[in-house]
Each structure stands twice: as structure tokens, then as C-alpha cells.
Interface confidence: medium
């Protein structure tokens, strides 16, 4: 197989080095020749020629292949011209010759993938590998080949991507800094707690890929899918040169699903304790796990230890809403929080679902606000509410919804950020229900919506005749 990798080498005498401490040279002869016919001689400048011990192997339909492996590491020297020539001993003739630099004929053995597992975000995959010759790993670049493992379609799309070793994996940005909040003050960003539509994943060809030494992070994969992957390496062409080696044996990995599918929502009320909840699946049990990470970059060869999230009793606040599983844990404000939910179905199959990582200050849930009103004139209401958290008044936004009695549809209003009240024009002689909810959405704190306040019933007065 390695011979085929050297096919583009037009030299009759082909040579390669796996680790730059070894050298193998070979050539093919169509005609069979008696043992001892050929000698492979080599010499560095100003040194006496030496013979390299030859072995031969019969090549069906091709004749004989003669192979020499340099016997001593001390004989394999870099950045220095090595003269090689094949001599027919009986005819005292040079059959073929070449001059090469060992540092330019690298053909690295494939790395062995030692771990492949989901990364810290849905659709991410972290892999680690072991380099057969670790001392040269700084001078190699890597290429990854992967594709979806689909038993029904063995010719699924394959992606080949060069691993960019100079970048660590993407920093876990604080999602949605102030600049992301320009539209409406309460525009719902895609947050770990968002129970909204799944974002479309980037096309596989655009999958981001980064590496750090012997580990690499791929993103943009489809959560919940299975993938196969292979790795190969090539000298970087700066210090050491050569060709791409062969691909490693394929490994397969099952990516966790996206916990958005379970409606995962995590929040804190006190910036100390975090509660997570997700929809309970039919005929299945589930368990939440968490871990904290300080690393903004991919930790090399470090795999998280997931801790149990302490279960709470199942809640079923209303018949229409699905039953939720809840759990809670103590958190820290100096690290990123990662959540995993494992769902075990009746036959005992375990499905994992990964939440998007978040900081505790991005998951602050406010208490339900209190709504007060008074009618100034017929149908003209003045509304007032207390900020549930005075410490973040300027970062609190509200939604007010109302509906006429007997109506199912709600009208939703968004007062300006930080407002403490407002006015509302309603039809006279009508009955309404009003509700208010709040959430943090500023540069310091963000979080999910509070629950809606208890419905406030309003009956507007008859029009006053002037």
C-alpha cells in the first residue's frame, strides 16, 4: 500500500522514511537474478561507501522487488545529501543511482485515533490521536477524513479536511454580547435555554476544524448522528518534507443529540444553584449530568468527568403541558456550565443529548413580576410593575400580553428596556385578561423568561359622555 503512495515518484530507486530515523529503499527488476547479483551502496559526502543489506521479494507479474532497510539510526542523517547507487556485482555496472535528502522523503505511519467523542457543543466532535513517532509530531500536519455512518448508504458524503494546528479550538465566546441585542430589546437569542426551532446546521463541507497537537475539534456535524473518521499525516514541508502517509484505521463515533429536542431549559434564581428541566419522554427514564470547565480552548487529552445533577420530583403543572424532569446542582460563576441528558428507553438503549454550554450569568431567571393597573378613563389603563430584581433594572425587559374574554389569541406588547410601566388603550365595556413576564437581556446578565404572572382580570368602564 505504501508503495502506491510513492507512485508519483519517478525515480526507479524509491526511498521513504517513516520517522526520519529510518530509511527504506527499494527498486524492481523484471528479470530474476541469482542471489548476490545486486548491491545497494550509499555514502554521505566525504565518507566511504557502505553496502545496505538487501532482501528480495517476488512480485507476481512484475518480477522481483529488492528492499533495503538502513541497519543503523546513526546512518540516517538529515539535511545532508545521501548518494545511493545499485550495482550489478557480476557486471561491475551501476544499474541506477540517485541523490536524496532523508529529510525530504518522509512517509509517516498513520496516527492511531485513541479517542473520539462529542465535544462541548451539540454537533461537535473531539478526537485525540497518538503519533507513532511523537518526537516528529511538531513537524507534521494532519488531515482528517470523515463521513456519516449510514448502514443503508455506504457511499455517503465524505469530507477531507486539513487540520489547522496553529489554532486551538474556537473560544467559547460569551454568547450574545450586547451587539447581538440590537433589534428588539427582548429579541430571543439562541440560548442554551431556548426551546425554539433547531438552527440549520452548516453544510458539512464548511465544518470547522481545529487542532491542538494530538487533539482536534470538529464542529458543524449533525447532532445525534454516527460518523466514521480517519486520520493521516504529512511532513509540514517547512523543516521536514515528504508525502502523505496512509490513512489510519477508521473509528466510529455516535454524537449526542441536541438537547433542544428535549426542550432543555436551565436557569438560576440566585446565581448559585442551577435548575435544569426537560420534557419527560414516554416510556423512558432520564438523568441529567453537568460539569464545569474553565478552559476557553480545547483541553488537550482532557475528557470531562460528568457529575450527577440531583433529581427533583416530576412536575406536571397543567394537563396540556408535557411532564418535565428537573434536576439541580450548585454552580460557580467563574466557569462554563455543560449539561448532558441521558434518556434510557424501555429496552435499555441510552440516548445522550447535549446542551449548549453557558455561564451562570447567562441563565438568570427572574421571579414572576407583579402587575398593577388602574383605569384613568374609559378603556385607558395605566399599568405599573415592580422590577423583580432592582440590581439589574436596566437589563430587564418585559412582555405584556392581553386577550379579550372568550378569545384564544393573545396580543403581545414589549415595553422599552427598563420601563416600570406604561399605558394601554382597550375597548370600553369589555373584559380582558392581562399577564406580564420578565427576563434579563443586558450586557451583564441574560436568561430565560420568567413564568407569566397570574392573569389580571380587567373590566373596562362605560364611555364617559362629555
Amino acid at each position: 500500500q505504501d508503495v502506491s503512495l510513492l507512485a508519483s515518484d519517478s525515480e526507479p530507486l524509491k526511498c521513504f522514511s517513516r520517522t526520519f530515523e529510518d530509511l527504506t529503499c527499494f527498486w524492481d527488476e523484471e528479470e530474476a537474478a541469482p542471489s548476490g547479483t545486486y548491491q545497494l551502496l550509499y555514502a554521505y559526502p566525504r565518507e566511504k561507501p557502505r553496502a545496505c543489506p538487501l532482501s528480495s521479494q517476488s512480485m507476481p507479474h512484475f518480477g522481483t522487488r529488492y528492499v533495503c532497510q538502513f541497519p543503523d539510526q546513526e546512518e540516517v542523517r538529515l539535511f545532508f545529501p545521501l548518494h545511493l547507487w545499485v550495482k550489478n556485482v557480476f557486471l561491475n555496472q551501476t544499474r541506477t543511482q540517485r541523490v536524496l535528502f532523508v529529510d525530504s522523503v518522509g512517509l509517516p505511519a498513520p496516527p492511531s485515533i485513541i479517542k473520539a467523542m462529542g465535544g462541548s457543543q451539540p454537533g461537535e466532535l473531539q478526537i485525540s490521536w497518538e503519533e507513532p513517532a511523537p518526537e516528529i509530531s511538531d513537524f507534521l500536519r494532519y488531515e482528517l477524513r470523515y463521513g456519516p455512518r449510514d448502514p443503508k448508504n455506504s457511499t455517503g458524503p465524505t469530507v477531507i479536511q486539513l487540520i489547522a494546528t496553529e489554532t486551538c479550538c474556537p473560544a467559547l465566546q460569551r454568547p450574545h454580547s450586547a451587539s447581538a441585542l440590537d433589534q428588539s430589546p427582548c429579541a430571543q437569542p439562541t440560548m442554551p435555554w431556548q426551546d425554539g426551532p433547531k438552527q440549520t446546521s452548516p453544510s458539512r463541507e464548511a465544518s470547522a476544524l481545529t487542532a491542538e497537537g494530538g487533539s482536534c475539534l470538529i464542529s458543524g456535524l449533525q447532532p445525534g448522528n454516527s460518523y466514521w473518521l480517519q486520520l493521516r499525516s504529512e511532513p509540514d514541508g517547512i523543516s521536514l518534507g515528504g508525502s502523505w502517509g496512509s490513512w489510519s484505521l477508521p473509528v466510529t463515533v455516535d454524537l449526542p443529540g441536541d438537547a433542544v429536542a428535549l426542550g432543555l431549559q436551565c436557569f438560576t434564581l440566585d446565581l448559585k444553584n442551577v435548575t435544569c428541566q426537560w420534557q419527560q419522554q414516554d416510556h423512558a427514564s432520564s438523568q441529567g449530568f453537568f460539569y464545569h470547565s474553565r478552559a476557553r480552548c480545547c483541553p488537550r487529552d482532557r475528557y470531562p468527568i460528568w457529575e450527577n445533577c440531583e433529581e427533583e420530583e416530576k412536575t406536571n403543572p397543567g394537563l396540556q403541558t408535557p411532564q418535565f424532569s428537573r434536576c439541580h446542582f450548585k454552580s460557580r460563576n467563574d466557569s462554563i456550565i455543560h449539561i448532558l441528558v441521558e434518556v434510557t428507553t424501555a429496552p435499555g438503549t441510552v440516548h445522550s443529548y447535549l446542551g449548549s454550554p453557558f455561564w451562570i450569568h447567562q441563565a438568570v431567571r427572574l421571579p414572576t413580576p407583579n402587575l398593577h393597573w388602574r383605569e384613568i378613563s374609559s378603556g385607558h389603563l395605566e399599568l405599573e410593575w415592580q422590577h423583580p430584581s432592582s440590581w439589574a433594572a436596566q437589563e430587564t425587559c418585559y412582555q405584556l400580553r392581553y386577550t379579550g374574554e372568550g378569545h384564544q389569541d393573545w396580543k403581545v406588547l414589549e415595553p422599552p428596556l427598563g420601563a416600570r410601566g406604561g399605558t394601554l388603550e382597550l375597548r370600553p365595556r369589555s373584559r380582558y385578561r392581562l399577564q406580564l413576564r420578565a427576563r434579563l437581556n443586558g450586557p451583564t446578565y441574560q436568561g430565560p423568561w420568567s413564568s407569566w404572572s397570574d392573569p389580571t382580570r380587567v373590566e373596562t368602564a362605560t364611555e364617559t359622555a362629555w
Partner: antibody, heavy 128, light 108 residues
Framework: QVQLVQSGAEVKKPGSSVKVSCKAS????????ISWVRQAPGQGLEWMGQ?????????WLAARANSRVTITADESTSTAYMELSSLRSEDTAVYYC????????????????????WGQGTTVTVSS | EIVLTQSPGTLSLSPGERATLSCRAS???????LAWYQQKPGQAPRLLIY???SRATGIPDRFSGSGSGTDFTLTISRLEPEDFAVYYC?????????FGQGTKVEIK
């Protein structure tokens, strides 16, 4: 981390000899070359020669200095020496020893000495 | 012997500016064996870059090296007051080892 420590300043008469030492700490001499470089006042850097430690000691000298320079080493003390004879006033310079990879190193030799390391310099003044 | 020619001889720049120093070899040099040094008056040369592009220990990342074959470049992305000095390139892949004549980077 290899460090090279050189002997102190010397003042010499024309026609005499000077022997400058360069001691390696934190590593042995094998696997790399000790080069000698000099810099006359206000001038650039001039390579004088090197001693290559390996299976056999090999001395390489720049053509200009050839006959007057001798480079030796004492492996037991990890010290290299550069002796310059028949001193002239134009030999007044700062003499540096530098550890560099050998020519045609094995991979391990190259990895051990990829980054050059220099001594602090020895000032030699030749004056009557 | 391989002759290294540095250009320009003198570079007059202000702090904060970008400096680009060139080193041209009379024949091909292995990238693994090209180094850049900084030297200030009365001091030994200080290794900045080895192997054409690898930064030596403790060298700030405003210094970067590039190039291969016969053309090599040292770039200082933003000159700091302490960067004004003489810079030498050196090849140590082929005996005799040789140095460029130096480029002086001075304050404008």
C-alpha cells in the same frame, strides 16, 4: 536548557597566543557542533570554525583563520577551547562560542540542537 | 561558501511601524538552518528566529520569520523602542557557516 559560559577577557601582545574556553552546562557536547565566531569593533560577525562532536571529533575551519586557529574539546568537563596563535592587532575582537546543529545530524541530534545557543563573549585585546 | 546579503543596510522607522528585513542567499539554504539575531551595542547577539520561522524562547510574537530557498524575511510587526538594533541573518546548514552583513534598524 544548555548554557555556554566563556572565560574572561584577555589582553595579549602581538605574536603571542590566546586560548578561550567555553563550558557547556545543562547538556553534553555530543550531538552538536561548537562554533567560534568573532566580531571586531564596529564590524559584523565572522565565523572562524567549529568542532563537531560525534563518533569522531571533526574540526572545520574557515579558510582565513585556518593555519592559526586550533579548536579542541575536553568531553569530561564539557568544555571547548579555541586557540589563536601569532596574534596581530586586527585579531582584537569579541570571540563568541555558539552551539549549532552538526552538519548531517541524526534526527535526535538535530532536535537537541535546533536552536543555536551562544556564549556571552570573551573580549581579546591585542596591543603592544 | 554561501554568501548572505541583507537589505536594506539601514532602516529608519518610528516606534509602532512595521519593519521588514530581507536576507538573500547566493544558493539555496535549508529552511531548518537559517537564523536571525538581534544585537545591541556591547551585547552578544540574541537569537530571535531559528529554522527560518521558529521563534526562540522568550521572543515576543511581534517578531516573525518566513521564507525558503534563497529568500528569507524577518518582520517586526510593530516596532517597540527596545527593537532598535542591528539584525543579522545566519545560515548554518552548509560549512562554512555564514552571516549577513547586518541591517541597522534606527529611530527616524
Amino acid at each position: 536548557q544548555v548554557q555556554l559560559v566563556q572565560s574572561g577577557a584577555e589582553v595579549k601582545k602581538p605574536g603571542s597566543s590566546v586560548k578561550v574556553s567555553c563550558k557547556a552546562s545543562g547538556g553534553t557536547f555530543s550531538s552538536y557542533a561548537i562554533s567560534w565566531v568573532r566580531q571586531a569593533p564596529g564590524q559584523g560577525l565572522e565565523w572562524m570554525g567549529q568542532l563537531i562532536e560525534g563518533p569522531t571529533l571533526r574540526q572545520w575551519l574557515a579558510a582565513r583563520a585556518n593555519s592559526r586557529v586550533t579548536i579542541t574539546a575536553d568531553e569530561s568537563t564539557s568544555t571547548a577551547y579555541m586557540e589563536l596563535s601569532s596574534l596581530r592587532s586586527e585579531d582584537t575582537a569579541v570571540y563568541y562560542c555558539a552551539r549549532l546543529p552538526i552538519e548531517g545530524p541524526t534526527l535526535r541530534q538535530w532536535l537537541a540542537a535546533r536552536a543555536p545557543v551562544w556564549g556571552q563573549g570573551t573580549t581579546v585585546t591585542v596591543s603592544s | 561558501e554561501i554568501v548572505l546579503t541583507q537589505s536594506p543596510g539601514t532602516l529608519s522607522l518610528s516606534p509602532g511601524e512595521r519593519a521588514t528585513l530581507s536576507c538573500r542567499a547566493s544558493q539555496s539554504v535549508s529552511s531548518s538552518y537559517l537564523a536571525w539575531y538581534q544585537q545591541k551595542p556591547g551585547q552578544a547577539p540574541r537569537l530571535l528566529i531559528y529554522g527560518a520561522s521558529s521563534r526562540a524562547t522568550g521572543i515576543p510574537d511581534r517578531f516573525s520569520g518566513s521564507g525558503s530557498g534563497t529568500d528569507f524575511t524577518l518582520t517586526i510587526s510593530r516596532l517597540e523602542p527596545e527593537d532598535f538594533a542591528v539584525y543579522y541573518c545566519q545560515q548554518y546548514g552548509s560549512s562554512p557557516w555564514t552571516f549577513g552583513q547586518g541591517t541597522k534598524v534606527e529611530i527616524k
